[in-house]
Interface confidence: medium
Amino acid sequence: IVLRPSRVHNSEENTMRALTLKDILNGTFSYKTFFPNWISGQEYLHQSADNNIVLYNIETGQSYTILSNRTMKSVNASNYGLSPDRQFVYLESDYSKLWRYSYTATYYIYDLSNGEFVRGNELPRPIQYLCWSPVGSKLAYVYQNNIYLKQRPGDPPFQITFNGRENKIFNGIPDWVYEEEMLATKYALWWSPNGKFLAYAEFNDTDIPVIAYSYYGDEQYPRTINIPYPKAGAKNPVVRIFIIDTTYPAYVGPQEVPVPAMIASSDYYFSWLTWVTDERVCLQWLKRVQNVSVLSICDFREDWQTWDCPKTQEHIEESRTGWAGGFFVSTPVFSYDAISYYKIFSDKDGYKHIHYIKDTVENAIQITSGKWEAINIFRVTQDSLFYSSNEFEEYPGRRNIYRISIGSYPPSKKCVTCHLRKERCQYYTASFSDYAKYYALVCYGPGIPISTLHDGRTDQEIKILEENKELENALKNIQLPKEEIKKLEVDEITLWYKMILPPQFDRSKKYPLLIQVYGGPCSQSVRSVFAVNWISYLASKEGMVIALVDGRGTAFQGDKLLYAVYRKLGVYEVEDQITAVRKFIEMGFIDEKRIAIWGWSYGGYVSSLALASGTGLFKCGIAVAPVSSWEYYASVYTERFMGLPTKDDNLEHYKNSTVMARAEYFRNVDYLLIHGTADDNVHFQNSAQIAKALVNAQVDFQAMWYSDQNHGLSGLSTNHLYTHMTHFLKQCFSLSD
């Protein structure tokens, strides 16, 4: 399927140009999306192009500025949050990034009723996390690892926790490993629906080994960054969950929520918290060996002022073929009866589908089924359930939004998006207002992204929120590459691939091939999305063919493919890339003397192993910030897929799957190894060990480090990185500069 045909008729050839590397580095062809900041069933906030915060009422068609750009600018605010009672706005400034999600900031509270900033009892700085209660204008915030509560913005704070300590005890915010690998948030506190209770996690990292690395900065001596970071098999954080009554916080203080007995018997994780009502909460727990998850529904006992989690309200989810869930264990979406819920987990055929749980998981009613997967439940109302899946036309890399009418019998299913803009839009997400009165659809491609507003009852499109007209016009004179998404059937495995072809692609000619790989468990690279990026440039200007292949271990095609890599990382992911390359050569238009592979992070691991596979297929390759041994990576992620690095568990494969073990095999390839020295995620240690092994084996290679850069290699490093990699590939493929 050719998704983006190139416009190369002879009459147009003179006016059209190829993409340049500068286009990519400058973000010339980046797109915009529009996600309404919903504040009611029919109202949303949006930051206008000139930075005013504007309130839109869909039903009246009216809009007005609630906060002017001057007010924003007066404190250099980069973000805002309106209190639910609409009395106050917090303004966020002095953003300072920490890890992937976490950052600190200065917060100012603006009183909308009198048009002035709240003075007196001002917030300390910098704050690690701050949020409004869901009703009214209570504030909870985390400062120096402790949680504070304000009943009103101008009130003095009430300190909830006192034991917070840097790198030791974290209250209301996650430590490094929980942030990156479990919660995927900067916060670990949750208001109950009406703001009566506040639940929070406490993470104790006292016994966790510390990763230390130098940050060179500009000083005479580098400083050392210390992060409690549990690598595979190491001591993990100890987590506890507490709930406090925010109306009378001093009355009984925080109450701990009990851990289910079958979880507490050995090392475990807390995985998520979902409030059901003000007096019912749902906690999810996971054994350290991550194939058993327990969902526990707890109720508030007024008489004892405690939280009771009866065994009858424990729901066990277990995987016998892999780990529990997909990347994470899915979270429940409760129905209006406040006890039954909808949840995505594997059906008997090994496909992730929506199930309805009324009493026990064993009696779950399967809501969706088929050889495809339900991916996300967006919203459950009294009569509808909205979800996304890749069912339509059997393309795993698509996402469409569906509505199941649960209020009628039998329930009927409707695809909301499948036929809206079929050529342009095959990959959607959605954002719903209260009670799903309205929703926004955000289409990511394969055509130019577009965001639209819809009526939640009729699904009728109300208006276009963002259609990227400027981008469309800018691309009119650009020779974009062609893209096709197809599949290879190999030994009962389906390998979906995306091929990016030069604009004047001619099947009778031979082209250099670059494989771009990620390949991590539960990932997906072959998606029907729009992108003008580095590989678009390589195809458009440099005449390369680029291919992305989803092999074993990747997501949304069933458990057989997903769990194939369980306890065997670094084997099948690599095999499947190699298999695909052989198939591409058979197609006849690939120059088999000019094949390269590159990847970042997990992709750097796979590209390194592919280069060292001894097949002779690859002339050269690049690994950016690769994992080199699973013993060096985080416990929560690594053990999910690999088990423990102990003799009686999986130590043997931990040792066999390192890049270093294959150092000799790099002798006949050109290898470029790249890493940031301040990578908090995949530590520089990984590349240092590869380099050491290659030196010890007397194997020549190229390397580039980026001083004080993390896993993202951002800012000026990005430009340097892509320029450097471009030179490397052009040299490898004998392309003139």
């Epitope: 500025t65 002017s68 001057r70 404190v75 009723s113 009198n114 048009g115 002035e116």
Partner: antibody, heavy 121, light 107 residues
């Protein structure tokens, strides 16, 4: 476009009263504090009075305290200045100004064209 | 009350000149200082707020500096439309007070 239109000025005898109005448009009136500033003929600017966005807080210069009352009607997007016990020294052009309250500043960012009040017998 | 003193009271300059007007507060007012321009028969116009922030739409040849008690308004290259009276104003505390004004005239 922000517009402020003062009215209600004129000639009044000492001891008399006047009510000035300021009709606002082009911005969300109820979100901003408002101010009256005056300028005697050939003289500099003098702050007279300010009122918070909700109308809950009012501030006055000592020279007018007890004689002038500032008020607003957010439903009508209108600011008022009720002036009683007028004196000759109150003769001036009276300006209404949209007032911006920043975290570390407070300023009069848009002004009307002014209305002349003359107190004379 | 906080007194605001501007200097000079008047000054003559030519198009293209760099001009500086100073304003002194009788006590520290942090950066709660604004500058206004007024032309004959017209309402004042805000130029600079919070001592150094340029109001939207005001040409970049205008700049402000200072904090505490001493403040400066600078016009880097005088244009014909800049001949007017300039006022400083403190908004640190009520009563909000203005300087007596500086009249900028063509030489």
């Amino acid at each position: 476009e922000v517009q402020l239109l003062e009215s209600g000025g004129g000639l009044v005898q000492p001891g008399g009263s006047l009510r000035l109005s300021c009709a606002a448009s082009g911005f969300t009136f109820s979100r901003y504090a408002m101010t009256w500033v005056r300028q005697a003929p050939g003289k500099g600017l003098e702050w007279v009075s300010s009122i918070s966005a909700s109308g809950g807080s009012t501030y006055y210069a000592d020279s007018v305290k007890g004689r002038f009352t500032i008020s607003r009607d957010n439903s009508k997007n209108t600011l008022y200045l009720q002036m009683n016990s007028l004196r000759a020294e109150d003769t001036a052009v009276y300006y209404c100004a949209k007032t911006f309250s920043g975290y570390a500043h407070y300023d009069f960012d848009y002004w009307g064209q002014g209305t002349l009040v003359t107190v004379s017998s | 009350d906080i007194q605001m003193t501007q200097s000079p009271s008047s000054l003559s300059a030519s198009v293209g000149d760099r001009v500086t007007i100073t304003c002194r507060a009788s006590q520290s007012i942090s950066s709660y200082l604004n500058w206004y321009q007024q032309k004959p028969g017209k309402a004042p116009k805000l130029l600079i707020y919070a001592a150094s922030s340029l109001q939207s739409g005001v040409p970049s040849r205008f700049s402000g500096s200072g904090s505490g008690t001493d403040f400066t308004l600078t016009i880097s290259s005088l244009q014909p439309e800049d001949f007017a009276t300039y006022y400083c104003q403190q908004s640190y505390s009520t009563p909000y007070t203005f300087g007596q004004g500086t009249k900028l005239e063509i030489k």
